[in-house]
Interface confidence: medium
């Protein structure tokens, strides 16, 4: 979570909430009483912008959080990496059947980069996200935070960009990091032929044909 963020060379980042300077300013619905942007400090006293919600005592929760518009840069399939911490309902005092331990991830393709409102029916569900058994422990100053990491992919995409949304249905959760990226095959030289950076196809297994060129001082 902390320190410089170095990602594999074949991954191109479209959104990294940890790289945003200042407030993220994503859109929440309802405006109050649902997701809230909260700054926490890591062990190096660096602020981490997180979104959290913890309405575990109230029934029928439906709290939405939407990112800003994300350009797809020609990618047909994108990957969403979410780092989050989710409280175990059994660890909370007094909670009954209202407490949940999952949240939902959605996306909505759009050519409009300035949509102001969340229209729930426009969003397509990607998956229900639960806390995995495996987690990393992160020091956030005066206590250790259990950090789960989940990666989902979505595609094929066709519009200029898209929005991501997170739906809370009554969990005690903090989104600590959201990263969206696509994968590419990096520039490759084979047998004096050079093949450029190439974005992967719509499916994880699809082959993309790309025209190469001769390296300098060589001919076809």
């Amino acid at each position: 979570v902390t320190g410089s963020r170095v990602y594999p060379a074949n991954e191109v980042t479209l959104l990294d909430s940890r790289s945003v300077q200042g407030e993220l300013g994503w859109i929440a619905s309802p405006l109050e009483g649902g997701w809230e942007e909260v700054s926490i400090m890591d062990e190096k006293n660096t602020p981490i912008r997180t979104y959290q919600v913890c309405n575990v005592m109230e029934p029928s929760q439906n709290n939405w959080l939407r990112t800003d518009w994300i350009t797809r840069e020609g990618a047909q399939r994108v990957y969403i990496e979410i780092k989050f911490t989710l409280r175990d309902c059994n660890s909370l005092p007094g909670v009954m059947g209202t407490c949940k331990e999952t949240f939902n991830l959605y996306y909505y393709e759009s050519d409009n980069d300035k949509e102001r409102f969340i229209r729930e029916n426009q969003f397509v569900k990607i998956d229900t996200i639960a806390a995995d058994e495996s987690f990393t422990q992160v020091d956030i100053g005066d206590r250790i935070m259990k950090l789960n990491t989940e990666i989902r992919d979505v595609g094929p995409l066709s519009k200029k960009g898209f929005y991501l949304a997170f739906q809370d249905v009554g969990a005690c959760i903090a989104l600590v990091s959201v990263r969206v990226f696509y994968k590419k095959c990096p520039l490759t030289v084979r047998n004096l032929a050079q093949f450029p950076d190439t974005i992967t196809g719509a499916d994880t297994s699809s082959l993309v044909e790309v025209r190469g060129s001769c390296v300098n001082n060589s001919e076809e």
Partner: antibody
Framework: QVQLKQSGPSLVQPSQSLSITCTVS????????VHWVRQSPGKGLEWLGV???????DYNAAFMSRLSITKDNSKSQVFFKMNSLQADDTAIYYC???????????????????WGQGTSVTVSS | DIQMTQSPSSLSASLGERVSLTCRAS??????LSWLQQKPDGTIKRLIY???TLDSGVPKRFSGSRSGSDYSLTISSLESEDFADYYC?????????FGAGTKLELK
Amino acid sequence: QVQLKQSGPSLVQPSQSLSITCTVSGFSLTRYGVHWVRQSPGKGLEWLGVIWRGGSTDYNAAFMSRLSITKDNSKSQVFFKMNSLQADDTAIYYCAKESLFGVYYDYGYYSMDYWGQGTSVTVSS
Amino acid sequence: DIQMTQSPSSLSASLGERVSLTCRASQEISGYLSWLQQKPDGTIKRLIYAASTLDSGVPKRFSGSRSGSDYSLTISSLESEDFADYYCLQYASYPLTFGAGTKLELK
């Protein structure tokens, strides 16, 4: 700073209802719930109920049939109403702010961190 | 309902003295306990939450601790403004329940 100011009658006739208003400042009712507690010489402190920040309520089963807690977020007011009062409902009634439960810190939902000044209510004819 | 048994019900002590009050929970409350102070005018103030965490602005002479199902509030050196009624509150489960209180008086 956080304040809870209560207003309501000091005398209620038997079988009548009690209405108390808790007007809050220094925090928003859309972010914090408000609890109600009473204190009587015979039974000590008793938790009556709570209205959560989303507007849903939870009541002590012993009072559920005659208790109603509502609020007006825009006016920062919480309304407490108890019906069919009898002499043993004579008590000091308090509203108290919920200490928000966090993802990282166990502040505890019910651990009321700020209290109103109390409304002393006598049930008598 | 969880019963909170508080002792002693009253306590006479002198200025500068160290005193301890105890609450015992009838069921497991996992440290979800607060200590409250009530002054003679009826004003209630929270001193401690989560069994041992001091509220901001509360003097360091107040401390909370836990030993199994027993929870204690200790005042290390009594000052004149500490003479009041003290209550424990469990917030582990519905309904929330309080101890019967301890009246701390000047000897």
